[in-house]
Interface confidence: low
């Protein structure tokens, strides 16, 4: 019926939070009455989402009022017998619309929970539930789908061609064929969606509906769509059986006739010809924060959200802290501007990520007699003999590269290194073989290579 701020709760807030237009969705969840209410427990008896969702527009400064809710019912199909006692959970979700909404697009505004006792086939029960600062006015009832009847929908009453002991027009029931269905309580033809009855043969209308069978919307005097005017006593009639009779659309989908067939407008989270496939598609607008929705290439995902910079998650619902990846080098300060990242560099560094070292040679001297060389936007040290590293602070081991050939021994020396050659070799690095006949020494072939190998001497 309505949802809004409760009475006497200070300055009333609007469900739209004065942030432009919004829509309210209601998720109804039924749980067994015997189980302890727990957030994580399943909606074992059934769950459904509201489908008739108008957009509420308001402006800052307007006085907040309860939002009227549309007539669309939230149908919760339940499996097996109706338990009578159950827990009713109603969640009110707000979807913020508009480009400048800011903050999360979806918010859970209220969650009301209560134990209920209700027999199937009874009248609408009205209720008001308050949670925090919000107040929800609603009605609920339980109905059996034919051929089930009874307070628990446990008996199936079907028409039979064979004679039965039931009265005229009444059907025998299984699994108790001796029992007969109860006489119809409401007036025959009373709209199951918009009418109810508390006395036999009556038809009372819910708000917004009128006519003896509650089939005429109050807002219109003429008949809608393909309905044809009937006698004054009956308001509008449907012209015989149609494709939408019995509502072939599951999960709260709304049916419309299209050239002899039907089409289901499915609620958010359902798709398929009869809305019986559960899952979200791009048509449901699942991508938040400006994410682009694309039909999933992977058959396991009905859609894929391509997120704008700064957002991540399967629905682009999470803001990325891009600075946590520490993209700025050399101690630069990271700034996330939303559309881009900016690095504020320390003195002596530059570049989009502070990756360029601008220090000149005047800034830092090279140790141990090294010489500073500038070039290419950076500086380096040319180290004195026996030293290495970025600032020539590391003592070099001249023998580390094994410079002495043919088994010569290397000795580190203040001016570099000295090679003590093995017998039969000579030279600064022991690279020459000594000929026993006194001829000139020749470069010795490395081990494993023949003296005459042309590759060696080309």
């Amino acid at each position: 019926h309505s949802f809004g701020p409760g009475p006497g709760l200070g300055t009333p807030r609007s469900p739209c939070n004065a942030r432009g237009p919004c829509r309210l969705f209601f998720r109804v969840c039924l749980k067994p009455g015997v189980s302890q209410e727990a957030t994580e427990s399943l909606c074992a008896l059934g769950a459904a989402l509201s489908t008739s969702v108008p957009v509420y527009t308001e402006h800052p400064g307007e006085s907040a009022a309860a939002l009227p809710l549309p007539d669309g019912l939230v149908r919760v199909p339940f499996r097996d017998a109706w338990p009578g006692t159950f827990s009713l959970v109603i969640e009110t979700w707000r979807e913020q619309l508009g480009e400048h909404a800011g903050g999360p697009a979806w918010n859970l505004l209220a969650r009301v929970v209560g134990r209920r006792r209700l027999a199937a086939g009874g009248p609408w029960a009205r209720d008001v539930q308050r949670t925090g600062t919000w107040e929800l006015h609603f009605s609920y009832r339980a109905r059996c789908e034919p051929p089930a009847v009874g307070a628990a929908c446990a008996r199936l009453c079907r028409s039979r061609s064979a004679p039965s002991r039931c009265g005229p027009g009444l059907r025998p029931c299984t699994p108790f064929p001796d029992e007969c269905e109860a006489p119809s309580v409401c007036r025959p033809g009373c709209s199951p969606e918009h009418g109810y009855c508390e006395e036999p043969d009556e038809c009372r209308c819910l708000e917004g509906w009128t006519g003896p069978l509650c089939t005429v919307p109050v807002s219109t005097s003429s008949c809608l769509n393909s309905r044809v005017p009937g006698p004054a006593s009956t308001g509008c009639l449907l012209p015989g059986p149609g494709p939408c009779d019995g509502n072939p659309c599951a999960n709260g989908g709304s049916c419309s006739e299209t050239s002899g067939s039907f089409e289901c407008a499915c609620p958010r989270g359902f798709y398929g010809l009869r809305c019986e496939v559960s899952g979200v598609t791009c048509a449901d607008g699942p991508c938040f924060n400006g994410g682009l929705c694309v039909g999933g290439e992977d058959p396991d995902s009905a859609y894929v959200c391509h997120c704008p910079p700064g957002f991540q998650g399967s629905n682009c619902e999470k803001r990325v802290d891009r600075c946590s990846l520490q993209p700025c080098q050399n101690g630069g300060l990271c700034l996330d501007l939303g559309h881009a990242l900016r690095c504020r560099c320390r003195a002596g560094f530059a570049g989009p990520r502070c990756e360029h070292d601008l220090d000149d040679c005047a800034g830092r001297a090279c140790a141990n007699g090294g010489t500073c060389v500038e070039g290419g936007g950076s500086r380096r040290c040319s180290c004195a003999l026996g030293f290495g590293g970025r600032d020539c602070r590391e003592r070099a081991d001249p023998c580390a590269s094994r410079p002495c050939a043919h088994g010569g021994r290397c000795y580190a020396h203040f001016s570099g290194l000295v090679c003590a050659c093995a017998p039969g070799y000579m030279g600064v690095r022991c690279e020459f073989a000594v000929r026993p006949d006194g001829a000139d020494a020749v470069p010795a072939a490395p081990r494993g290579l023949r003296q005459a190998d042309p590759q060696r001497f080309l």
């Epitope: 994580e40 399943l42 010809l273 009869r274 496939v277 058959p299 396991d300 399967s314």
Partner: antibody, heavy 116, light 107 residues
């Protein structure tokens, strides 16, 4: 590389129980609805059960023939899918495959034989 | 339950020939139809999803088509490695169901 590996199959007597396990790697297990599918020469490929995500309260669906007998479950922290099978009958014999929900990814299967 | 009926039960083709496999649904399933290839002693492998979309890594000689109740898998030029059983399946409504398969043999 995507990999699904089932285990826990074997020979069991009619009326007995068995728990199948499937470990998944190569994709984000917690983001995928998962199913078990079985195959036998008599019935061909037969969908058994499905489990959805944590955000769906791990909602499950079952084939009519296994409802009340089999329980599908998952452990997202271990990337594991399970199928607890009770009151097994000879007609439950077959190769049981662990699959992603719309059957894009399949394991190699584990053979379950129900026989006296 | 939606029944998926495949025909023919088996087909024998020579390398290079074109083959068409049929799958009929007992009621409208939109385009929520998949084709799987199952080679001997292997698990099924997805070939086509959404009736006509080729799955990652599937050669372009495989083509899926159809909607509502009639679906077709066409192999443009059969290769020796295509010897396998081909299954169709629907995920339009619960319970998901599969066809009994078509065996493709190579002459």
């Amino acid at each position: 590389e995507v990999n699904l590996e089932e285990s826990g199959g074997g020979l069991v007597q009619p009326g007995g129980s068995m728990k199948l396990s499937c470990v998944v790697s190569g994709f984000t297990f917690s983001n995928y609805w998962m199913s078990w599918v079985r195959q036998s020469p008599e019935k061909g490929l037969e969908w058994v059960a499905e489990i959805r995500l944590k955000s769906d309260n791990y909602a499950t669906h079952y084939a009519e023939s296994v409802k009340g007998k089999f329980t599908i479950s998952r452990d997202d922290s271990k990337s594991r899918l399970y199928l607890q099978m009770n009151s097994l009958r000879p007609e439950d014999t077959g190769i049981y495959y662990c699959t992603s929900n719309r059957f894009a990814y399949w394991g190699q299967g584990t053979l379950v034989t129900v026989s006296a | 339950n939606i029944v998926m009926t495949q025909s023919p039960k088996s087909v024998s083709m020579s390398v290079g020939e074109r083959v068409t496999l049929s799958c009929k649904a007992s009621e409208n399933v939109g385009t929520y139809v998949y084709w799987y290839q199952q080679k001997p002693e292997q698990s099924p492998k997805m070939m086509i999803y959404g009736a006509s979309n080729r799955y990652t890594g599937v050669p372009d000689r495989f083509t899926g088509s159809g909607s509502a109740t009639d679906f077709t898998l066409t192999i443009r030029s059969v290769q020796a490695e295509d010897l396998a059983d081909y299954h169709c399946g629907q995920s339009y409504s619960y319970p998901f169901t599969f066809g009994s398969g078509t065996k493709l043999e190579i002459k």
